[in-house]
Interface confidence: medium
């Protein structure tokens, strides 16, 4: 469809509330350091302008693209260069280069303090101005996560408001709010990581990589839907995510709503698990569809071998329509294997493709590809064994101990990576234990590998900004589906030159005593990484001793009447002790 005014079209489709929310998210994801009030002003101006275009689509500037309108707004900010430096250089470019330039300046690791919920203050804000409270939430999440899936953020903002509606009435606001906010925070962080991986796959590996990922995932979830139906959804979904990852949030949200509508209208041919989703309002409906439970497999599925090994026409099918044939293979394999991770399914499809590529050029192709399915077993065994070993380690060490084991493992593999990144990534990798190891056997593999893909993507995203390790670059860029096996296969870096011992790194202060448990752990784990960078060959025994001594030293000083004085006296002794243990 062509519209005289794109902004008027989106305003009418989305309605004022969602329109304003999405515009706020868009600006917050680009200008991550601007105060909330500045963004509100921009949103107000854009909304007023959109309304004039709704009233008269021929009004001045209404025919401009949304990129042009948004870009002009950003570039009109007087303090742009002062606050954002070379982001202002984008303003010298024309569209579409200007928008591409803005996208490249998004910061995945902005220097913004962690949000600490204060129930009393938050309830006061909520009761004073609900609309502002909603906007502030969108702003705070969007600026910290510049690739957050915008329509999904609108959904989380509704849930956030609901939590406050309920808990601000409660006698003990904190007891009601804190666990709910923490639960929501985990969901939001997972959602951010999932979307970041989707955007990375589109931007770094192309739309086809994203479509293959979606085809496998949707085939697992909707095994009753036929290939054609899944393909249509995959195509539409790719468009939605391409738009959101590209900053076209209004178009993205609009197209997502259309896709939800289509899925619900055709749910009879897609899945039996969508009924209750389709009765919900728009944002809840889209979220529910995205999280829908896996449908049961059809009872009459034929052996895969028939179409993909025994059929004499395999090479004809492969040669004449490669993508469709391989797509059908991936669909058929995925719907039969809800227990496999998406990455594993894509690795299997790659092996199948490589085998046909080789065999179909030979004299007797059927004899050559007859055993292709046997080649898949090692691909399945590798992650299964790895998960088994790591879950055993997790059971033995507990979450904190398991994280420390991963810190040691990854610091030895890639010691060039910055300490904060190693700590963040290893801590997140360590959470796979509590997330997945308790799951039933048939869910463990997909749970673990798909979660690890999210965490390793975070490492890749952070490393790309300041590349320091060729090994990391290689694992991140060579193959999306082989990232996890690539990192797993890395061995300790023997070429690494140990860091000088810097005493300041091991200097601690009284603030350590009042820190929440997780922040205390981060301090200790930061010291552990620094220790390993200084002594990469430290034994497990030495590291255990140092960590034990560290815990004793902190406990002693936090129990002393004058914390700071104790740290000042005992700190240097602890440093000498460390050096002695590692000598």
């Amino acid at each position: 469809d062509t519209y005289k005014s794109e902004i008027a079209h989106r305003f009418k489709d989305l309605g004022e509330q969602y329109f304003k929310g999405l515009v706020l998210i868009a600006f917050s994801q680009h200008l991550q350091q601007c105060p909330y009030e500045e963004h509100v002003k921009l949103v107000r101006e854009v909304t007023e302008f959109a309304k004039t275009c709704v009233a008269d689509e021929s009004a001045e500037n209404c025919d401009k693209s949304i990129h042009t309108l948004f870009g002009d707004k950003l570039c009109a900010i007087p303090s742009l260069r002062e606050h954002y430096g070379d982001l202002a250089d984008c303003c010298e470019k024309e569209e579409p280069e200007r928008n591409e330039c803005f996208l490249q300046h998004k910061n995945d690791n902005p220097d913004i303090p962690k949000l600490k919920p204060d129930p009393v203050a938050l309830c006061a804000d909520f009761q004073e101005d609900e609309q502002k409270f909603w906007g502030k939430y969108l702003y705070e999440i969007a600026r910290r996560h510049p690739y957050f899936y915008a329509p999904e953020l609108l959904y989380y903002a509704i849930i956030y408001k609901d939590v406050f509606s309920e808990c601000c009435q409660a006698a003990d606001k904190a007891a009601c709010l804190l666990p709910k906010i923490e639960h929501l925070r985990e969901k939001v962080l997972t959602s951010a990581a999932k979307q970041r991986l989707k955007c990375a796959s589109i931007q770094k590996f192309g739309e086809r990589a994203f479509k293959a990922w979606s085809l496998a995932r949707l085939s697992q979830r909707f095994p009753k839907a036929d290939f054609t139906e899944i393909s249509k959804i995959v195509t539409d979904l790719a468009k939605v995510h391409k738009e959101c990852c590209h900053g076209d949030l209004l178009e993205c949200a609009d197209d997502r709503a259309d896709l939800a509508k289509y899925i619900c209208e055709n749910q009879d041919t897609i899945s039996t698990k969508l009924k209750e989703c389709c009765d919900k309002p728009l944002l809840e409906k889209s979220h529910c569809i995205a999280e829908a439970k896996r449908d049961e497999l059809p009872a009459d599925l034929n052996p895969l071998e028939h179409d993909f090994v025994e059929d004499k026409e395999v090479c004809k099918n492969y040669k004449e329509a490669k993508h469709v044939f391989l797509g059908t293979f991936l669909y058929e394999y995925s719907r039969r294997h809800p227990d496999y991770s998406v990455s594993l399914l894509l690795r299997i499809a790659k092996i199948y493709e490589a085998t046909l590529e080789d065999c179909c050029a030979k004299e007797d192709p059927p004899a050559c590809y007859a055993t292709v399915f046997d080649k898949f077993q090692p691909l399945v065994d590798e992650p299964k064994n790895l998960i088994k070993q790591n879950c055993e380690l997790f059971e033995k060490l507990g979450e904190y101990g398991f994280q420390n084991a991963l810190i040691v493992r990854y610091t030895k593999k890639v010691p060039q990576v910055s300490t904060p990144t190693l700590v963040e990534v290893a801590r997140k990798l360590g959470l796979v234990g509590s997330r997945c190891c308790k799951r039933p056997e048939e869910e463990r593999l997909s749970c673990a590998e798909d979660y690890l893909s999210l965490v390793l993507n975070r490492l890749c995203v952070l490393h790309e900004k300041t590349p320091v390790s060729e090994k990391v670059t290689k694992c991140c860029t060579e193959s999306l589906v082989n990232r996890r096996p690539c990192f797993s296969a890395l061995t300790p870096d023997e070429t690494y030159k140990p860091k000088e011992f810097v005493e300041g790194t091991f200097t601690f202060h009284a603030d350590l005593c009042t820190l929440p448990e997780d922040e205390k752990q981060i301090k200790k784990q930061t010291a552990l990484v620094e220790l390993l960078k200084h002594k990469p060959h430290a034994t497990e025994e030495q590291l255990r001793t140092v960590l034990g001594n560290f815990a004793a030293f902190v406990q002693k000083c936090c129990a002393a009447p004058d914390h700071e004085a104790c740290f000042a006296v005992e700190g240097p002794k602890f440093v000498i002790e460390i050096r002695g243990i590692l000598a």
């Epitope: 839907a225 036929d226 290939f227 054609t228 139906e229 899944i230 393909s231 009459d300 034929n302 028939h306 179409d307 059929d311 026409e313 004809k316 099918n317 004449e320 329509a321 469709v324 044939f325 059908t328 669909y331």
Partner: nanobody
Framework: EVQLLESGGGLVQPGGSLRLSCAAS????????VAWFRQAPGKEREFVAG????????YYADSVKGRFTISRDNSKNTLYLQMNSLRPEDTAVYYC???????????????????WGQGTLVTVSS
């Protein structure tokens, strides 16, 4: 649910021609593997010709290659089988079959097709 309805059968002399049609109710028939099978009295059902979905890749049984042509008209949601140089051994009930969601994979195995028409009789006799 996919409904298939064949037409065009009848009595024809050896060497003559017939064109069978199969109208489908499925909205994605253009992207679906569809085929013609036949069953002569007292014999097994056998594959005659097939056409892949999306990309029109065609497949034929050796016994009909060069004489029969399978095609479809996506705008009419209809599959055709043009039969020339007919022989008495082509006498059979001809069925149209569909495998939705299986573009390309036109199997020659009847059991793999979930949807069938009711059949149309072709008799080749002088």
């Amino acid at each position: 649910e996919v409904q298939l309805l064949e037409s065009g059968g009848g009595l024809v002399q050896p060497g003559g021609s017939l064109r069978l049609s199969c109208a489908a109710s499925y909205r994605y028939i253009d992207e679906t593997a569809v085929a013609w099978f036949r069953q002569a009295p007292g014999k097994e059902r056998e594959f005659v010709a097939g056409i892949g979905g999306g990309v029109d890749i065609t497949y034929y049984a050796d016994s009909v290659k060069g004489r029969f042509t399978i095609s479809r008209d996506n705008s009419k949601n209809t599959l055709y089988l043009q039969m020339n140089s007919l022989r008495p051994e082509d006498t059979a009930v001809y069925y149209c079959a569909a495998r939705p969601g299986r573009p390309l994979i036109t199997s020659k195995v009847a059991d793999l097709y979930p949807y069938w028409g009711q059949g149309t009789l072709v008799t080749v006799s002088s």
